[in-house]
């Protein structure tokens, strides 16, 4: 009996850039021969239904019809058939299918591979044009993927230490495309300073589906207006 | 900075068991496989077999098929390698070294070494 | 088994010499245009230390001095100017095949 199995869920994601290694075990009755085996890997676009060959690998010979794109011989003697995909691109998103061939028996499974890419976040001040007293505190997002992404403020006074979600005086602008396919968005929060206590802390939160944790950036307000912190660290996907 | 740090020295008697953890740092564990190497003393090296983490699949020499288990804890970086019914010429230095396995074979990384002593 | 055959068993060269490890196979370790034989270094109460992989292409942070050749059944390690921390014994070992084995080692002295 020869099974293939792919990532439990059946779909893995992955960073942008990264070295992916798109999982496909085999389960053979008998120990596994390299040389009297075929392996092919094929990748269906989300745009078009299209199958194309990713790379082959039969007995004496392998070839990668991607760039870079390999299976390991080492690992495929002890069932491992998962295919590495160098550098990988938003565009090579999709469903991948692993074909393995035993003579006389085939086996096959698909998985869905999603290609994400976390958010910078920066947060700036804005005064030009603004009344006295009155600031506009922009949080800019930058190089996400995919466009889906939720902004929002938060503030922590020393009264009320825990943070309370700001709802009033905040924009948020379009998603921009940029020209590598990822994503751009800018929020904005209008403060009228006077209304404040000073020593209020203002948090920019960002939340991602490649981050693990929301990305935060915060700026206190003190009696000399505001003071801009830098974006505070998070893990981001891996 | 590719760590390998081994479990220190075993002293055993002959016909029991040993083994050996290799904790592994400065990389993703399961894009590599881990090689274990041993050398007796004053001889050469001798491959032992490799453990590819991603999946836990073997690949042993035939001369310690049936005596070694190599295995891996993927949550902790952690390769280890058992070896039962012991004799006195299994005294040897033990290594395990972190192997390239997509684009080439070969062990890049090496741990500090295990000296396991069999006697009686 | 693929046997690996290394000659010298062991070699004295004066400093700033050329040194030259032969190491022969019982059988080729080519596989699809890549041959499989890679050369460490060993000195005294340390690990091995990976110089050459794939033949001929030299892992980071290996001295350019450092070099390897060959295909099929046949291979060379050379190192152009012997400098005195290259004293040490030379393993070549095969991974076309397994078990991968290594070669008996040459013991590189200064003369």
């Known amino acids: 009996d020869l099974k293939v199995e792919m990532m439990a869920g059946g779909t893995q994601i992955t960073p942008l850039n990264d070295n992916v290694t798109i999982f496909c075990n085999i389960f053979y009755s008998q120990p596994l021969n390299i040389t009297s085996m075929g392996i092919t890997w094929f990748w269906k676009s989300l745009t078009f239904d299209k199958e194309v060959k990713v790379f082959e690998f039969f007995g004496d010979h392998q070839e990668a019809f991607r760039p870079g794109a390999i299976v390991s011989p080492w690992r495929l003697k002890s069932g491992d058939a998962s295919l590495r995909l160098p550098g990988i691109q938003l565009e090579e998103a999709g469903e991948y299918r692993c074909e393995v061939v035993v003579t006389p028996l085939k086996a096959q499974g698909t998985v869905q591979l999603e290609v994400v890419a976390s958010p910078a976040s920066r947060l700036l001040l804005d005064q030009v044009g603004m009344k006295e007293n009155e600031d506009k505190y922009m949080c800019e997002s930058s190089g996400f993927y995919p466009e889906a992404i939720n902004i929002t403020w938060e503030k922590q006074t020393q009264k009320f230490p825990h943070p309370i979600e700001i709802s009033e005086d905040v924009i948020t602008g379009p998603t921009i495309k940029n020209m590598d396919g990822t994503f751009n968005v800018t929020s904005c929060l209008k403060l009228n300073s006077s209304q404040e206590d000073p020593g209020t802390v203002y948090q920019c939160v960002v939340r991602h589906a490649s981050l693990h944790t929301p990305l935060r950036s915060n700026f206190t307000l003190t009696a000399a207006r505001h003071s801009l912190s830098e974006t505070e660290k998070t893990d981001n996907f891996s | 900075e590719v760590q390998l740090v081994q479990s220190g020295a075993e002293v055993k008697k002959p016909g029991a068991s040993v083994k050996v953890s290799c904790k592994a740092s400065?990389?993703?564990?399961?894009?590599?496989?881990m090689d274990w190497v041993r050398q007796a003393p004053g001889q050469g090296l001798e491959w032992i077999g490799d453990?590819?983490?991603?999946?836990?699949?073997?690949l042993y020499n035939q001369k310690f098929r049936g005596r070694v288990t190599l295995t891996v804890d993927t949550s902790i970086s952690t390769a280890y390698m058992e070896l039962s019914r012991l004799r006195s010429d299994d005294t040897a230095v033990y290594y395990c070294?972190?192997?390239?396995?997509?684009?080439?074979?070969?062990?890049?990384?090496w741990g500090q070494g295990t000296t396991v002593t069999v006697s009686s | 088994d693929i046997v690996l055959t290394q000659s010298p068993d062991s070699l004295a060269v004066s400093l700033g010499e050329r040194a030259t490890i032969n190491c022969k196979a019982s059988?080729?370790?080519?596989?699809?245009?890549?041959?499989?034989m890679n050369w460490y270094q060993q000195k005294p109460g340390q690990p091995p230390k990976l110089l050459i992989y794939?033949?001929?292409t030299l892992h980071s942070g290996i001295p350019d001095r450092f070099s390897g050749s060959g295909s099929g059944t046949d291979f060379t390690l050379t190192i152009s100017s012997l400098q005195a921390e290259d004293v040490a014994v030379y393993y070549c070992?095969?991974?076309?095949?397994?078990?991968?084995?290594f070669g008996q080692g040459t013991k590189l002295e200064i003369k």
């Open positions: 059988q080729s370790v080519d596989y699809d245009g890549d041959s499989y």
């Open positions: 400065g990389y993703t564990f399961t894009d590599y496989n």
């Open positions: 070294a972190r192997s390239e396995v997509f684009y080439g074979n070969y062990a890049d990384y």
């Open positions: 070992q095969q991974s076309k095949e397994d078990p991968r084995t």
């Open positions: 794939a033949a001929s």
């Open positions: 453990i590819n983490p991603n999946n836990g699949g073997t």
